[in-house]
């Protein structure tokens, strides 16, 4: 299989994943579809880290479009070698993939911290607090304690679901970018395509 085709496939996948990350992160700002919690600053502090919007979203679009552009046959040779431009492009995609790894890594770390800490909610005492912060993530295994959060309604389910989605999406993005690092190195060193006989018209 052509290294370029592989990169293009990864690129398209990353665009979809990035958009899903942005949507998941935006939903975190509106528990139960309400805007008041964001305006009153009653949202988990990790929501404000924009991990899905920036890390797993916008930052992921840069490598995604770089990867998609790799299969286009508009890259001419360098140093008198027609294949050299393609090889340079594949190697430069490694840099883009590293940016993707950083973005997805940030998304994964923030989502994991958000899950571990739990949501900011109105606790059983009637105060806005991180009710589960001291449980070190154990609240995730004991759903009976989730009723300790009384407002926003179902905030624990909301936070757990969306941060888990961000964690999973960020993880997949991380793996895809890692694959592209390997793909880009192989494509750059071994040649743009597995078939060394393949010629490109400039």
């Amino acid at each position: 299989m052509c290294y370029g085709k592989c990169a293009r496939c990864i690129g398209h996948s990353l665009v979809g994943l990035a958009l899903l990350c942005i949507i998941a992160n935006i939903l975190l700002y509106f528990p139960n579809g309400e805007t008041k919690y964001a305006s009153e600053n009653h949202l988990s502090r990790f929501v404000w880290f924009f991990s899905g919007i920036v890390g797993g979203g916008l930052l992921m679009l840069l490598p995604a479009f770089v990867f998609i552009g790799l299969e286009q046959d508009d890259c001419c040779g360098c140093c008198g070698h027609e294949n050299c431009g393609k090889r340079c492009a594949m190697l430069s995609s490694v840099l883009a993939a590293l940016i993707g790894i950083a973005g997805s890594g940030y998304c994964v770390i923030v989502a994991a911290l958000g899950l571990a800490e739990g949501p900011l909610c109105l606790d059983s005492f009637g105060q806005w607090n991180y009710t589960f912060a001291s449980t070190e993530g154990q609240y995730l295994l004991d759903t009976s304690t989730w009723s300790q959060c009384t407002e926003p309604k179902h905030i624990v389910e909301w936070n757990v679901s969306l941060f888990s989605i961000l964690l999973a999406l960020g993880g997949i993005e991380f793996i895809l970018c890692l694959i592209q690092v390997i793909n880009g190195v192989l494509g750059g060193i071994c040649g743009f395509c597995c078939s060394r006989q393949q010629q490109y018209d400039c």
């Epitope: 502090r45 800490e117 059983s124 005492f125 009637g126 105060q127 806005w128 991180y130 009384t150």
Partner: antibody, heavy 118, light 113 residues
Framework: EVQLQQSGPELVKPGASVKISCKTS????????MHWVRQSHGKSLEWIGS?????????NYNQKFKGKATLTVDKSSSTVYMDLRSLTSEDSAVYYC??????????WGQGTTLTVSS | DIVMSQSPSSLAVSAGEKVTMSCKSS????????????LAWYQQKPGQSPKLLIY???TRESGVPDRFTGSGSGTDFTLTISNVQAEDLTVYYC?????????FGGGTKLEIK
């Protein structure tokens, strides 16, 4: 206007039980947690516990008052109750119900004076 | 339990003066996650229920005159009344709601000089 109307003064004998009520009005009852505080004559304030009417009712108690106080609610009348049992002269005090907002008790009942005497 | 210590227990002042009272807690009341101090100040006049003046250590409750100011963080807090009025001469309590059981200070009584 937020109002917390408490039941009248009580004079009871040692060992008896009493039920103090706190009827709320002027706000959405389920939006706030109700707390109970007591003040012995000429002394400071003591937190007894809280009752959150959501999720089937969530109660928190000061360990000192566990077994002494029980908090209940009647949602239909937006009223919170506090049962006090095995009363002694030490329990003679003014008992307040109060609503929490942010981290402060922003509305208070007028207080219920409990006198335990033989 | 968190112990709240208020000082002085009583204070003699004249109308128009600026007065400062202290409240110290046995452990920090600052929540590092919410970045708020879980401390409130109350005023209680004889025969009346307490009245909320300050919450989150420094946020003035609506309707409370701006001569009342709360400050401090962690374990040391202060309530300042600038230009004391005759109606301010009463008892003031601080309260922590950082950890249950919530506890009140012993109070500071403002008296006429």
């Amino acid at each position: 206007e937020v109002q917390l109307q408490q039941s009248g003064p009580e004079l009871v004998k040692p060992g008896a039980s009493v039920k103090i009520s706190c009827k709320t009005s002027g706000y959405t009852f389920t939006d706030y947690t109700m707390h109970w505080v007591r003040q012995s004559h000429g002394k400071s304030l003591e937190w007894i516990g809280s009752f959150n009417p959501n999720n089937g009712g969530l109660t928190n108690y000061n360990q000192k008052f566990k077994g002494k106080a029980t908090l209940t609610v009647d949602k239909s009348s937006s009223t919170v109750y506090m049962d006090l049992r095995s009363l002694t002269s030490e329990d003679s005090a003014v008992y307040y119900c109060t609503r929490i907002r942010a981290t402060g008790f922003d509305s208070w009942g007028q207080g219920t004076t409990l006198t335990v005497s033989s | 339990d968190i112990v709240m210590s208020q000082s002085p227990s009583s204070l003699a002042v004249s109308a128009g003066e600026k007065v400062t009272m202290s409240c110290k807690s046995s452990q920090s009341l600052l929540n590092s996650r919410t970045r708020k101090n879980y401390l409130a100040w109350y005023q209680q006049k004889p025969g009346q229920s307490p009245k909320l003046l300050i919450y989150w250590a420094s946020t003035r409750e609506s309707g409370v005159p701006d001569r009342f100011t709360g400050s401090g963080s962690g374990t040391d807090f202060t309530l300042t009344i600038s230009n004391v009025q005759a109606e301010d001469l009463t008892v003031y309590y601080c309260k922590q709601s950082y950890n249950p059981p919530w506890t009140f200070g012993g109070g500071t009584k403002l008296e006429i000089k």
